[in-house]
């Protein structure tokens, strides 16, 4: 009762390998690494056959089929390129994930190379079977911002794409009679989060209670250049409005807030985040030059707070920007302490502007980003948010604009955004 000689399948083997097989002998068919046993269209690791009493094998020898990892998973904000010809997805084939540059970059500078493993899964040396993450690039406008050597007196029109993080925040509080409408600025931090000043998102109440406006009353415009033409802009509603829990309306201490957008916005040449600074209590160094952009800065005879409280009628049509130096803290404190009224400049604030005055000292919308270029990382970093100014008209001598010191709130911002700092390290200024 001898069974016929067995031929191992291509890319496979038979064990035990014998010259002759008799009744009740069993054979295990297996395949080389990267191949699977295929029997009746069913894939398996091994297949056993037996020599029967009548001298026949219990089954035909199966075939060995190369492992197929199939089409790789889509990567959000990423692309896939196939290293092997004909876009093969079989064992030892290679693919490369890359992010949609220049707007996204791969977390931890991963190679993005994945190989089809013997187990039939795409594997990366570092991440294993997990897909890489494409994080938004920050602080790198598609258009170069101007050199900061020459001082700009007053505001200038910003070219589209110069301030891709700039957001226009429009609040229409329909719970008020009559309806209240006002606007402010903000800065895009990621595809889903806007940083702004708390006083922009505080309900304009008849008392000093701090209550945020309802998220339903907030609209955010991104990629906006000329307010008369919103067609090219992305507008988004708010999913969450988060005011700093310690925001104090009496002195505007902790004047910082976040808006989570209903849907992540697609990044592009006119919509890109700004970088957050390091956690640093000192804040920006005195005399450093920064830029502020906004739509409310074309009116030289009103203060920032008057702009924000007077509704959209004071909007400048085209986004403006101005260049301002950081003022030493002691000098700013002294200039405000000499005024009547509660003008305390706290450690959570810094000042910017010029001693001699000029309309540039109070340009910019409330909540707008005061950005400084970081030479080390070659990125623009949000160091301040337009917060408040003196009671005098814009351009009064020794009236500096006061900004929320963002570097004091980096931990709070990451916490609200629900991201551990390690995950977003590439976004932090080096």
């Amino acid at each position: 009762n001898e069974c016929p000689e067995l031929q191992p399948p291509v890319h496979g083997k038979i064990e035990p390998s014998q010259a002759k097989y008799f009744f009740k002998d069993q054979v295990l068919v297996s395949c080389d690494t990267g191949y699977k046993v295929l029997k009746d269209n069913v894939e398996m690791d091994t297949f056993q056959i037996e020599c029967l009493k009548d001298g026949t094998w219990s089954n035909k020898i199966p075939t060995c089929k190369i492992v197929d990892c199939r089409a790789p998973g889509e990567l959000e904000h990423g692309l896939i390129t196939f290293s092997t010809r004909n876009n093969l997805t079989t064992y030892k084939s290679e693919i490369k994930y890359s992010c949609q540059e220049p707007y996204y970059k791969m977390l931890n500078n991963n190679t993005g190379i994945y190989t089809c493993s013997a187990q039939g899964v795409w594997m990366n040396k570092v991440l294993g079977r997990s897909l890489p993450t494409c994080l938004p690039e920050c602080g790198q406008p598609s258009r170069s911002l101007p050199s900061l050597v020459k001082r700009i007196i007053g505001g200038r029109n910003a070219e589209p794409g110069l301030f891709p993080w700039q957001a226009l925040i429009v609040v229409e509080d329909t719970s008020r009679v009559p309806n209240d409408k006002w606007f402010g600025s903000g800065a895009l931090l990621s595809a889903s989060w806007i940083l702004t000043a708390a006083h922009v998102l505080r309900s304009q109440r008849r008392d000093t209670t701090v209550i945020p406006v309802s998220k339903e009353h907030v609209t955010v415009y991104l990629g906006l250049h000329d307010v008369r033409d919103k067609s090219g802009a992305v507008n988004s509603s708010a999913a969450r409005v988060v005011l700093h829990p310690d925001f104090n309306i009496q002195n505007y201490n902790h004047d910082i807030a976040l808006v989570q957008l209903q849907e992540p916005v697609p990044l592009g040449p006119h919509v890109m985040p700004v970088c957050l600074p390091r956690l640093e209590p000192e804040g920006p160094a005195p005399h450093m030059l920064g830029l502020v952009a906004g739509w409310g800065i074309s009116n030289p005879n009103v203060t920032v707070d008057e702009i924000i409280s007077s509704g959209t009628r004071t909007l400048s049509d085209v986004l403006q920007y101005v260049k301002l130096p950081v003022v030493p803290h002691a000098e700013c404190k002294t200039s405000y302490e000499s005024r009547s009224g509660n003008y305390s400049v706290t450690e959570n604030m810094f000042c910017a502007g010029y001693y001699e005055g000029g309309k540039d000292t109070c340009l910019g919308d409330s909540g707008g980003a005061f950005v400084i270029f970081d030479d080390l990382s070659q990125r623009w970093v949000v160091q301040g948010l337009v917060s408040w100014g003196g009671p005098e008209e814009c351009g009064s001598k020794q009236v500096y604009g006061v900004y929320t010191k963002v570097s004091n709130y980096v931990d709070w911002v990451w916490e609200q955004m629900g991201l551990p700092q390690s995950v977003v390290e590439p976004q932090v200024e080096r």
Epitope: S175, R205, R206, D207, I249, E306, S309, N342, Y343
Partner: antibody, heavy 114, light 112 residues
Framework: QVQLVQSGAEVKKPGASVKVSCKAS????????INWVRQAPGQGLEWIGW????????KYNDKFKDRATLTVDTSSNTAYMELSSLRSEDTAVYYC???????WGQGTLVTVSS | DIVMTQSPDSLAVSLGERATINCKSS????????????LAWYQQKPGQPPKLLIY???TRESGVPDRFSGSGSGTDFTLTISSLQAEDVAVYYC????????FGQGTKVEIK
Amino acid sequence: QVQLVQSGAEVKKPGASVKVSCKASGYTFTTDDINWVRQAPGQGLEWIGWIYPRDDRTKYNDKFKDRATLTVDTSSNTAYMELSSLRSEDTAVYYCSSLEDTYWGQGTLVTVSS
Amino acid sequence: DIVMTQSPDSLAVSLGERATINCKSSQSLLNSRTRKNYLAWYQQKPGQPPKLLIYWASTRESGVPDRFSGSGSGTDFTLTISSLQAEDVAVYYCKQSYNLYTFGQGTKVEIK
């Protein structure tokens, strides 16, 4: 339209507690605060406290903070003001107001008498 | 605590004449950041809840006749009824909302 409807008049003995309700309708209850004010017969207005239904934040007049408790039930859009250890000088009309005093309840007379 | 003091306690004015009520606070009600004075005026008629007339010292509430106006800043405020009508007979209260809330003691306005 916005309406604040308060519970009916109460007569209480000294030392007892009273709980006045204020049912809101016609607006989103959680988007604005509720204030409680009282007025003793022939006297002026006296602020008791404030509650914000969205997060249950409260503020009290120091005079009432040990005896008054403000609560809300967002499922029924109702605010409550409980005053304990009642004394005769607590006899007053108690008002709730909302949307920053744009709308007021009709008032609830609480009489404290032995 | 902020103390609010109204004057006079009562006022009799002829129909069509101007009525002026003053309110003084024990500390400034002007917020230097928002640039608003957190002072409101209320009207209360017998058996009715108070009615908000003016907020932020000078902003008239929707639906309030323009004969009612508010003025002042810091610690001194005024409610003016430019031409008194019969339906204006009531008690008027000022209220600060700068730090919690405090009402003035009230001013009774009658027709002379």
